[in-house]
Amino acid sequence: EVEKTACPSGKKAREIDESLIFYKKWELEACVDAALLATQMDRVNAIPFTYEQLDVLKHKLDELYPQGYPESVIQHLGYLFLKMSPEDIRKWNVTSLETLKALLEVNKGHEMSPQVATLIDRFVKGRGQLDKDTLDTLTAFYPGYLCSLSPEELSSVPPSSIWAVRPQDLDTCDPRQLDVLYPKARLAFQNMNGSEYFVKIQSFLGGAPTEDLKALSQQNVSMDLATFMKLRTDAVLPLTVAEVQKLLGPHVEGLKAEERHRPVRDWILRQRQDDLDTLGLGLQGGIPNGYLVLDLSMQEALS
Protein backbone atom coordinates (compact mmCIF):
# COMPACT_ATOMS: atom_id res chain seq x y z
CA GLU A 1 0.00 0.00 0.00
CA VAL A 2 1.43 3.37 -1.02
CA GLU A 3 1.19 6.20 1.49
CA LYS A 4 -1.02 9.11 0.45
CA THR A 5 1.15 12.22 -0.03
CA ALA A 6 0.54 15.47 -1.91
CA CYS A 7 1.93 15.75 -5.42
CA PRO A 8 4.99 18.05 -5.56
CA SER A 9 4.49 21.31 -7.43
CA GLY A 10 4.82 20.99 -11.21
CA LYS A 11 4.77 17.19 -11.15
CA LYS A 12 1.08 16.58 -11.77
CA ALA A 13 0.83 14.26 -14.79
CA ARG A 14 -1.02 15.82 -17.72
CA GLU A 15 -0.64 12.63 -19.76
CA ILE A 16 0.82 9.15 -19.49
CA ASP A 17 4.26 9.50 -20.99
CA GLU A 18 7.88 8.38 -20.54
CA SER A 19 8.68 11.12 -18.05
CA LEU A 20 6.75 9.04 -15.48
CA ILE A 21 9.39 6.32 -15.38
CA PHE A 22 11.55 8.77 -13.41
CA TYR A 23 8.83 9.21 -10.76
CA LYS A 24 9.24 7.48 -7.44
CA LYS A 25 6.42 5.20 -6.33
CA TRP A 26 4.89 7.79 -4.03
CA GLU A 27 5.05 10.43 -6.77
CA LEU A 28 3.21 8.15 -9.19
CA GLU A 29 0.56 7.54 -6.56
CA ALA A 30 0.17 11.23 -5.80
CA CYS A 31 0.58 12.73 -9.26
CA VAL A 32 -1.13 10.35 -11.69
CA ASP A 33 -4.90 10.58 -11.85
CA ALA A 34 -6.54 7.14 -12.07
CA ALA A 35 -9.10 8.31 -14.64
CA LEU A 36 -6.30 9.69 -16.83
CA LEU A 37 -4.48 6.35 -16.54
CA ALA A 38 -7.64 4.46 -17.52
CA THR A 39 -8.19 6.53 -20.65
CA GLN A 40 -4.52 6.29 -21.70
CA MET A 41 -3.85 2.65 -20.82
CA ASP A 42 -2.70 1.98 -24.37
CA ARG A 43 0.40 4.11 -23.66
CA VAL A 44 1.54 2.14 -20.63
CA ASN A 45 2.72 -0.80 -22.70
CA ALA A 46 5.15 1.38 -24.64
CA ILE A 47 6.70 2.81 -21.47
CA PRO A 48 9.32 0.77 -19.62
CA PHE A 49 7.88 1.11 -16.12
CA THR A 50 9.61 -0.87 -13.41
CA TYR A 51 7.96 -3.80 -11.66
CA GLU A 52 7.28 -1.68 -8.58
CA GLN A 53 5.88 1.23 -10.59
CA LEU A 54 3.45 -1.19 -12.25
CA ASP A 55 2.23 -2.13 -8.76
CA VAL A 56 1.27 1.50 -8.23
CA LEU A 57 -0.53 1.73 -11.58
CA LYS A 58 -2.48 -1.45 -10.87
CA HIS A 59 -3.38 -0.15 -7.42
CA LYS A 60 -4.78 3.03 -8.98
CA LEU A 61 -6.93 1.05 -11.43
CA ASP A 62 -8.15 -1.23 -8.61
CA GLU A 63 -9.27 1.80 -6.62
CA LEU A 64 -11.04 3.29 -9.63
CA TYR A 65 -12.78 0.03 -10.57
CA PRO A 66 -13.34 -2.02 -7.40
CA GLN A 67 -16.01 -4.14 -9.16
CA GLY A 68 -13.68 -5.04 -12.04
CA TYR A 69 -12.17 -3.18 -14.99
CA PRO A 70 -14.29 -2.25 -18.01
CA GLU A 71 -13.37 -3.89 -21.30
CA SER A 72 -12.08 -0.58 -22.70
CA VAL A 73 -9.32 -0.74 -20.07
CA ILE A 74 -8.79 -4.51 -20.20
CA GLN A 75 -8.14 -4.42 -23.95
CA HIS A 76 -5.19 -2.07 -23.43
CA LEU A 77 -3.65 -3.63 -20.33
CA GLY A 78 -0.72 -5.05 -22.27
CA TYR A 79 1.93 -6.47 -19.98
CA LEU A 80 0.13 -5.06 -16.92
CA PHE A 81 -2.14 -8.10 -17.44
CA LEU A 82 0.69 -10.19 -16.00
CA LYS A 83 0.20 -8.34 -12.70
CA MET A 84 -3.42 -9.47 -12.46
CA SER A 85 -4.46 -12.34 -10.22
CA PRO A 86 -7.14 -14.90 -11.15
CA GLU A 87 -9.33 -13.17 -8.52
CA ASP A 88 -8.97 -9.86 -10.37
CA ILE A 89 -9.84 -11.50 -13.69
CA ARG A 90 -12.95 -13.21 -12.32
CA LYS A 91 -14.46 -9.74 -11.90
CA TRP A 92 -14.09 -8.99 -15.62
CA ASN A 93 -16.58 -9.34 -18.41
CA VAL A 94 -14.55 -9.95 -21.57
CA THR A 95 -16.66 -10.29 -24.72
CA SER A 96 -14.39 -9.13 -27.54
CA LEU A 97 -12.13 -11.59 -29.30
CA GLU A 98 -9.74 -8.69 -29.95
CA THR A 99 -9.38 -8.17 -26.20
CA LEU A 100 -8.68 -11.86 -25.70
CA LYS A 101 -6.03 -11.86 -28.46
CA ALA A 102 -4.35 -8.75 -27.05
CA LEU A 103 -3.97 -10.35 -23.63
CA LEU A 104 -2.88 -13.75 -24.93
CA GLU A 105 -0.17 -12.00 -26.93
CA VAL A 106 1.47 -10.90 -23.66
CA ASN A 107 1.85 -14.54 -22.63
CA LYS A 108 2.83 -15.81 -26.08
CA GLY A 109 5.28 -18.69 -26.17
CA HIS A 110 4.75 -19.56 -22.51
CA GLU A 111 2.69 -22.16 -20.73
CA MET A 112 -0.85 -21.29 -19.86
CA SER A 113 -0.73 -19.42 -16.56
CA PRO A 114 -3.57 -19.45 -13.99
CA GLN A 115 -4.38 -15.90 -15.14
CA VAL A 116 -4.71 -16.96 -18.77
CA ALA A 117 -6.76 -20.03 -17.85
CA THR A 118 -9.15 -17.82 -15.85
CA LEU A 119 -9.36 -15.29 -18.67
CA ILE A 120 -10.23 -17.99 -21.22
CA ASP A 121 -12.77 -19.53 -18.86
CA ARG A 122 -14.47 -16.14 -18.36
CA PHE A 123 -14.48 -15.49 -22.11
CA VAL A 124 -15.86 -18.87 -23.14
CA LYS A 125 -18.52 -18.84 -20.42
CA GLY A 126 -19.56 -15.37 -21.56
CA ARG A 127 -19.98 -16.61 -25.13
CA GLY A 128 -21.86 -19.74 -24.09
CA GLN A 129 -19.91 -22.00 -26.42
CA LEU A 130 -16.52 -22.47 -28.05
CA ASP A 131 -17.23 -20.97 -31.47
CA LYS A 132 -14.85 -21.42 -34.40
CA ASP A 133 -13.15 -18.00 -34.14
CA THR A 134 -12.46 -18.48 -30.43
CA LEU A 135 -11.13 -21.98 -30.96
CA ASP A 136 -8.98 -20.73 -33.84
CA THR A 137 -7.48 -18.09 -31.58
CA LEU A 138 -6.95 -20.33 -28.56
CA THR A 139 -5.34 -23.19 -30.46
CA ALA A 140 -3.06 -20.72 -32.28
CA PHE A 141 -1.68 -19.57 -28.92
CA TYR A 142 -2.00 -22.90 -27.09
CA PRO A 143 -1.97 -25.95 -29.37
CA GLY A 144 -2.82 -28.20 -26.40
CA TYR A 145 -5.81 -26.09 -25.34
CA LEU A 146 -8.51 -28.44 -26.59
CA CYS A 147 -7.04 -31.39 -24.70
CA SER A 148 -6.98 -29.37 -21.47
CA LEU A 149 -10.80 -29.29 -21.47
CA SER A 150 -12.94 -31.89 -19.72
CA PRO A 151 -15.31 -34.04 -21.80
CA GLU A 152 -18.16 -31.98 -20.35
CA GLU A 153 -16.57 -28.72 -21.51
CA LEU A 154 -15.84 -30.23 -24.93
CA SER A 155 -19.50 -31.05 -25.35
CA SER A 156 -20.12 -27.29 -25.83
CA VAL A 157 -17.90 -27.25 -28.94
CA PRO A 158 -20.19 -26.95 -31.99
CA PRO A 159 -19.32 -29.26 -34.93
CA SER A 160 -18.63 -26.21 -37.11
CA SER A 161 -15.69 -25.31 -34.82
CA ILE A 162 -13.98 -28.61 -35.56
CA TRP A 163 -12.75 -27.14 -38.85
CA ALA A 164 -10.36 -24.99 -36.82
CA VAL A 165 -8.67 -28.00 -35.20
CA ARG A 166 -5.24 -29.04 -36.45
CA PRO A 167 -3.77 -32.54 -35.87
CA GLN A 168 -1.22 -31.20 -33.35
CA ASP A 169 -4.06 -29.71 -31.28
CA LEU A 170 -5.15 -33.26 -30.42
CA ASP A 171 -1.74 -34.69 -29.52
CA THR A 172 -2.37 -34.76 -25.80
CA CYS A 173 -6.07 -35.69 -25.87
CA ASP A 174 -7.05 -38.86 -24.05
CA PRO A 175 -9.68 -41.38 -25.27
CA ARG A 176 -12.46 -39.80 -23.20
CA GLN A 177 -11.91 -36.47 -24.92
CA LEU A 178 -11.73 -38.04 -28.39
CA ASP A 179 -14.96 -39.91 -27.66
CA VAL A 180 -16.65 -36.50 -27.43
CA LEU A 181 -14.82 -34.89 -30.35
CA TYR A 182 -15.08 -37.73 -32.86
CA PRO A 183 -18.87 -37.59 -33.43
CA LYS A 184 -18.59 -33.82 -33.89
CA ALA A 185 -15.80 -34.28 -36.44
CA ARG A 186 -17.79 -36.96 -38.26
CA LEU A 187 -20.69 -34.54 -38.53
CA ALA A 188 -18.48 -31.64 -39.56
CA PHE A 189 -16.75 -33.54 -42.37
CA GLN A 190 -19.69 -35.67 -43.52
CA ASN A 191 -20.00 -34.03 -46.94
CA MET A 192 -16.37 -34.61 -47.95
CA ASN A 193 -15.34 -37.34 -50.35
CA GLY A 194 -13.46 -40.49 -49.23
CA SER A 195 -9.79 -39.51 -49.30
CA GLU A 196 -10.37 -35.90 -48.18
CA TYR A 197 -12.64 -37.13 -45.41
CA PHE A 198 -10.00 -39.52 -44.13
CA VAL A 199 -7.32 -36.81 -44.04
CA LYS A 200 -9.58 -34.61 -41.89
CA ILE A 201 -11.02 -37.33 -39.63
CA GLN A 202 -7.73 -39.17 -39.07
CA SER A 203 -6.69 -37.16 -35.98
CA PHE A 204 -10.04 -37.84 -34.30
CA LEU A 205 -10.17 -41.61 -34.90
CA GLY A 206 -9.13 -42.35 -31.32
CA GLY A 207 -12.83 -41.87 -30.58
CA ALA A 208 -14.21 -43.97 -33.48
CA PRO A 209 -16.43 -47.03 -32.86
CA THR A 210 -15.92 -50.43 -34.54
CA GLU A 211 -18.57 -49.91 -37.20
CA ASP A 212 -16.86 -46.74 -38.46
CA LEU A 213 -13.50 -48.50 -38.63
CA LYS A 214 -15.14 -51.32 -40.59
CA ALA A 215 -16.60 -48.77 -43.00
CA LEU A 216 -13.19 -47.12 -43.43
CA SER A 217 -11.61 -50.48 -44.21
CA GLN A 218 -13.75 -50.61 -47.36
CA GLN A 219 -12.38 -47.29 -48.63
CA ASN A 220 -8.67 -47.99 -49.34
CA VAL A 221 -7.56 -45.42 -46.79
CA SER A 222 -4.11 -46.91 -45.94
CA MET A 223 -4.14 -45.87 -42.29
CA ASP A 224 -0.65 -45.44 -40.83
CA LEU A 225 0.44 -47.43 -37.76
CA ALA A 226 0.69 -44.34 -35.55
CA THR A 227 -3.03 -43.68 -36.11
CA PHE A 228 -3.91 -47.36 -35.68
CA MET A 229 -2.08 -47.50 -32.33
CA LYS A 230 -4.23 -44.62 -31.04
CA LEU A 231 -7.52 -46.35 -31.81
CA ARG A 232 -9.75 -47.52 -28.95
CA THR A 233 -8.85 -51.10 -28.03
CA ASP A 234 -12.53 -52.02 -27.70
CA ALA A 235 -13.14 -50.69 -31.23
CA VAL A 236 -10.23 -52.64 -32.74
CA LEU A 237 -10.88 -56.04 -31.10
CA PRO A 238 -13.92 -57.01 -33.22
CA LEU A 239 -12.15 -56.25 -36.52
CA THR A 240 -11.26 -59.28 -38.61
CA VAL A 241 -7.78 -59.90 -40.01
CA ALA A 242 -9.09 -59.07 -43.48
CA GLU A 243 -10.56 -55.77 -42.25
CA VAL A 244 -7.35 -54.74 -40.53
CA GLN A 245 -5.40 -55.65 -43.67
CA LYS A 246 -7.68 -53.45 -45.79
CA LEU A 247 -7.63 -50.65 -43.23
CA LEU A 248 -3.82 -50.50 -43.08
CA GLY A 249 -3.08 -51.35 -46.72
CA PRO A 250 0.70 -51.32 -47.25
CA HIS A 251 1.21 -50.31 -43.61
CA VAL A 252 0.02 -53.72 -42.41
CA GLU A 253 3.64 -54.86 -42.20
CA GLY A 254 4.10 -52.50 -39.24
CA LEU A 255 1.93 -54.76 -37.08
CA LYS A 256 4.93 -57.04 -36.43
CA ALA A 257 6.87 -54.27 -34.71
CA GLU A 258 3.86 -53.44 -32.53
CA GLU A 259 2.72 -56.99 -31.68
CA ARG A 260 3.54 -56.58 -27.97
CA HIS A 261 1.72 -53.25 -27.61
CA ARG A 262 -1.96 -52.37 -27.28
CA PRO A 263 -4.23 -52.46 -29.19
CA VAL A 264 -2.30 -54.83 -31.52
CA ARG A 265 -1.43 -57.30 -28.74
CA ASP A 266 -5.04 -57.61 -27.57
CA TRP A 267 -6.32 -57.82 -31.14
CA ILE A 268 -3.90 -60.69 -31.97
CA LEU A 269 -5.19 -62.66 -28.96
CA ARG A 270 -8.72 -62.46 -30.44
CA GLN A 271 -7.80 -63.68 -33.94
CA ARG A 272 -7.47 -67.25 -35.23
CA GLN A 273 -3.83 -68.10 -35.77
CA ASP A 274 -4.74 -69.41 -39.22
CA ASP A 275 -6.08 -65.98 -40.19
CA LEU A 276 -3.02 -64.20 -38.77
CA ASP A 277 -0.76 -66.52 -40.78
CA THR A 278 -2.36 -65.30 -44.00
CA LEU A 279 -0.66 -61.92 -43.41
CA GLY A 280 2.75 -63.60 -43.64
CA LEU A 281 4.17 -61.40 -40.89
CA GLY A 282 4.94 -64.10 -38.34
CA LEU A 283 2.44 -62.75 -35.83
CA GLN A 284 2.05 -65.22 -32.93
CA GLY A 285 -0.42 -65.55 -30.09
CA GLY A 286 -3.65 -66.10 -31.97
CA ILE A 287 -6.28 -68.74 -31.11
CA PRO A 288 -4.98 -72.17 -32.11
CA ASN A 289 -6.88 -74.05 -34.78
CA GLY A 290 -9.73 -76.22 -33.54
CA TYR A 291 -10.43 -74.09 -30.46
CA LEU A 292 -13.93 -72.75 -29.88
CA VAL A 293 -14.21 -69.05 -29.08
CA LEU A 294 -16.87 -68.17 -26.52
CA ASP A 295 -17.97 -64.56 -26.28
CA LEU A 296 -18.24 -64.30 -22.48
CA SER A 297 -19.47 -60.73 -22.62
CA MET A 298 -22.51 -61.97 -24.54
CA GLN A 299 -23.07 -64.72 -21.97
CA GLU A 300 -22.91 -62.19 -19.11
CA ALA A 301 -25.43 -59.97 -20.85
CA LEU A 302 -27.89 -62.84 -21.16
CA SER A 303 -27.62 -64.01 -17.52
Epitope: P48, L54, L82, V106, N107, K108, G109, H110
Partner: nanobody, 118 residues
Framework: QVQLVESGGGLVQAGGSLRLSCAAS????????YGWYRQAPGKGLELVAI???????NYADSVKGRFAISKDNVNNTVYLQMNSLTSEDTGVYYC????????????WGQGTQVTVSS
Protein backbone atom coordinates in the same frame (compact mmCIF):
# COMPACT_ATOMS: atom_id res chain seq x y z
CA GLN B 1 19.78 -18.03 -15.11
CA VAL B 2 20.05 -14.36 -16.00
CA GLN B 3 23.23 -12.64 -14.92
CA LEU B 4 24.14 -8.97 -15.26
CA VAL B 5 27.77 -8.03 -14.69
CA GLU B 6 28.75 -4.36 -14.55
CA SER B 7 32.25 -3.03 -15.16
CA GLY B 8 33.98 0.26 -15.89
CA GLY B 9 33.45 2.02 -12.56
CA GLY B 10 36.24 3.70 -10.65
CA LEU B 11 37.67 6.95 -9.37
CA VAL B 12 37.62 9.93 -11.73
CA GLN B 13 38.28 13.67 -11.46
CA ALA B 14 35.38 16.13 -11.73
CA GLY B 15 34.83 17.00 -15.38
CA GLY B 16 36.17 13.61 -16.47
CA SER B 17 34.46 10.70 -18.25
CA LEU B 18 33.74 7.02 -17.61
CA ARG B 19 32.11 4.30 -19.67
CA LEU B 20 30.18 1.65 -17.80
CA SER B 21 29.44 -1.71 -19.39
CA CYS B 22 26.84 -4.30 -18.46
CA ALA B 23 27.21 -7.79 -19.91
CA ALA B 24 24.00 -9.82 -19.82
CA SER B 25 23.97 -13.62 -20.03
CA UNK B 26 21.38 -16.40 -19.68
CA UNK B 27 18.71 -14.42 -21.51
CA UNK B 28 16.17 -16.70 -23.20
CA UNK B 29 13.38 -14.16 -23.69
CA UNK B 30 12.81 -10.83 -25.43
CA UNK B 31 14.11 -7.98 -23.26
CA UNK B 32 11.70 -5.07 -22.91
CA UNK B 33 14.27 -2.51 -21.76
CA TYR B 34 17.70 -2.07 -20.20
CA GLY B 35 18.49 0.65 -17.72
CA TRP B 36 21.00 2.10 -15.28
CA TYR B 37 20.10 3.06 -11.72
CA ARG B 38 22.35 4.68 -9.19
CA GLN B 39 22.40 4.98 -5.44
CA ALA B 40 24.26 7.91 -3.96
CA PRO B 41 25.56 7.58 -0.38
CA GLY B 42 22.65 7.81 2.07
CA LYS B 43 20.05 8.17 -0.71
CA GLY B 44 17.51 5.95 -2.46
CA LEU B 45 17.76 4.31 -5.88
CA GLU B 46 17.43 6.73 -8.77
CA LEU B 47 16.79 5.81 -12.40
CA VAL B 48 19.49 7.44 -14.52
CA ALA B 49 18.88 6.21 -18.06
CA ILE B 50 16.85 3.58 -19.85
CA UNK B 51 16.80 2.16 -23.38
CA UNK B 52 13.86 0.21 -24.74
CA UNK B 53 14.01 -2.82 -27.04
CA UNK B 54 13.31 -0.54 -29.99
CA UNK B 55 16.20 1.75 -29.05
CA UNK B 56 14.23 4.64 -27.50
CA UNK B 57 16.29 6.33 -24.78
CA ASN B 58 15.21 8.35 -21.75
CA TYR B 59 17.30 10.21 -19.19
CA ALA B 60 16.81 11.70 -15.74
CA ASP B 61 16.87 15.50 -15.88
CA SER B 62 20.07 15.58 -13.82
CA VAL B 63 22.09 13.74 -16.48
CA LYS B 64 20.50 14.93 -19.73
CA GLY B 65 23.11 16.07 -22.24
CA ARG B 66 25.95 14.45 -20.26
CA PHE B 67 25.11 10.73 -20.19
CA ALA B 68 24.34 8.44 -23.14
CA ILE B 69 22.94 4.91 -22.93
CA SER B 70 23.42 2.46 -25.79
CA LYS B 71 23.23 -1.27 -26.40
CA ASP B 72 24.95 -3.89 -28.48
CA ASN B 73 22.27 -6.46 -29.35
CA VAL B 74 24.76 -8.98 -30.72
CA ASN B 75 26.80 -9.18 -27.51
CA ASN B 76 23.90 -8.47 -25.14
CA THR B 77 25.82 -5.58 -23.64
CA VAL B 78 24.56 -2.19 -22.46
CA TYR B 79 26.76 0.86 -22.03
CA LEU B 80 26.50 4.11 -20.13
CA GLN B 81 28.84 6.82 -21.40
CA MET B 82 29.20 9.44 -18.65
CA ASN B 83 30.77 12.79 -19.47
CA SER B 84 31.30 16.04 -17.50
CA LEU B 85 31.07 14.11 -14.24
CA THR B 86 30.44 15.98 -10.99
CA SER B 87 30.56 14.91 -7.36
CA GLU B 88 26.76 14.59 -7.51
CA ASP B 89 27.27 11.59 -9.83
CA THR B 90 29.10 9.60 -7.14
CA GLY B 91 27.38 6.37 -6.18
CA VAL B 92 26.91 2.70 -6.98
CA TYR B 93 25.58 2.20 -10.52
CA TYR B 94 23.33 -0.79 -11.15
CA CYS B 95 22.45 -2.26 -14.51
CA UNK B 96 18.97 -3.67 -14.84
CA UNK B 97 16.73 -5.26 -17.46
CA UNK B 98 13.01 -5.78 -17.81
CA UNK B 99 11.22 -8.90 -18.90
CA UNK B 100 7.63 -8.23 -19.98
CA UNK B 101 6.57 -11.29 -21.99
CA UNK B 102 5.35 -14.43 -20.21
CA UNK B 103 6.19 -12.94 -16.84
CA UNK B 104 6.90 -9.55 -15.30
CA UNK B 105 10.37 -9.51 -13.86
CA UNK B 106 13.19 -7.03 -13.34
CA UNK B 107 16.76 -8.36 -13.13
CA TRP B 108 19.57 -6.45 -11.42
CA GLY B 109 23.36 -6.54 -11.43
CA GLN B 110 25.59 -6.33 -8.36
CA GLY B 111 26.61 -2.75 -9.08
CA THR B 112 29.84 -0.89 -9.84
CA GLN B 113 31.16 2.01 -7.77
CA VAL B 114 31.70 5.40 -9.39
CA THR B 115 33.53 8.03 -7.34
CA VAL B 116 33.98 11.56 -8.65
CA SER B 117 36.53 13.61 -6.73
CA SER B 118 36.61 17.39 -6.84
Amino acid sequence: QVQLVESGGGLVQAGGSLRLSCAASGITFPVNAYGWYRQAPGKGLELVAIISAGGTTNYADSVKGRFAISKDNVNNTVYLQMNSLTSEDTGVYYCYLQRRIGMLRDYWGQGTQVTVSS
